[in-house]
Amino acid sequence: QGGTRSPRCDCAGDFHKKIGLFCCRGCPAGHYLKAPCTEPCGNSTCL
């Protein structure tokens, strides 16, 4: 059936995880995610 693998995000620095289609940097504490990144190891849009 598959689909259970969650490949490790191989990005420089911490706090990257797959959000949307790419590995993205998560939002800092106290902020929420407005939009995920649109490139590998990119920055999410946080508010």
Epitope: G2, G3, P7, C9, D10, G20, L21, F22, P40
Partner: antibody, heavy 120, light 111 residues
Framework: EVKLVESGGGLVKPGGSLKLSCSAS????????MSWVRQTPEKRLEWVAA???????FYPDSLKGRFTISRDNARNTLYLQMSSLGSEDTALYCC??????????????WGQGTSVTVSS | DIVLAQSPASLLVSLGQRATISCRAS??????????MHWYQQKPGQPPKLLIY???NLESGVPARFSGSGSGTDFTLNIHPVEEEDAATYYC?????????FGAGTMLELK
């Protein structure tokens, strides 16, 4: 066996709307990112939209506002709502599954497609 | 948008010889230690089939006569030795950013 079966295509007049469906089987649909890709009569491939497993939608700027991707995980079905259609939208529309080993969009299974013709 | 220029548009190769297909990107598709370029094969009446991902990784079940190389903006798909069943159109695709784009395709014909 992974199967993706598209339906809903047909002949539509310029300015019209159409909703395409893609029925998925043979894999855990809800765990996968999915895309719609179209193939023009000149055989060019164009990415149309994507819906990630965690609920985000993505479009090329050129189609944003006219096309809407959605999914029903309970029905294992991906949809594409298309509006304000023009002759440039004439194509074979395929749904594609993104590979689950990848943290980037690459498509490892494709459906045969459903044909959309925009003409008066 | 990243434009992918494939060459040649068509290729005539003898059985057992080498086929080389090029894909050039309008900007680098390499970042974070990876090259986000992928290759597909499409036979008439069939949907595309993934051959190679991240420039050089062979998809499961794809014969070892297919290989990919390159980084930055220049990428190559090699088929050696070419077999009859390899007659098809080959497309490159990047996932360096959105929107995803594809090359225009290279049609491989056998002599």
């Amino acid at each position: 066996e992974v199967k993706l079966v598209e339906s809903g295509g047909g002949l539509v007049k310029p300015g019209g709307s159409l909703k395409l469906s893609c029925s998925a089987s043979g894999f855990a649909f809800s765990n996968y990112d999915m895309s719609w890709v179209r193939q023009t009569p000149e055989k060019r491939l164009e990415w149309v939209a994507a819906f990630s497993s965690d609920g985000y939608t993505f479009y090329p700027d050129s189609l944003k506002g006219r096309f809407t991707i959605s999914r029903d995980n309970a029905r294992n079905t991906l949809y594409l709502q298309m509006s304000s259609l023009g002759s440039e939208d004439t194509a074979l529309y395929c749904c594609a599954r993104h590979a689950d080993y990848a943290n980037y969009p690459v498509m490892d299974y494709w459906g045969q497609g459903t044909s959309v013709t925009v003409s008066s | 948008d990243i434009v992918l220029a494939q060459s040649p548009a068509s290729l005539l190769v003898s059985l057992g010889q080498r086929a080389t297909i090029s894909c050039r990107a309008s900007k680098s598709v390499s970042t974070s230690g990876y090259s986000y370029m992928h290759w597909y094969q499409q036979k008439p009446g069939q949907p595309p089939k993934l051959l190679i991902y991240l420039a050089s990784n062979l998809e499961s079940g794809v014969p070892a006569r297919f290989s990919g190389s390159g980084s930055g903006t220049d990428f190559t798909l090699n088929i050696h030795p070419v077999e009859e069943e390899d007659a098809a159109t080959y497309y490159c695709q990047h996932s360096r950013e959105l929107p995803l784009t594809f090359g225009a395709g290279t049609m491989l014909e056998l002599k």
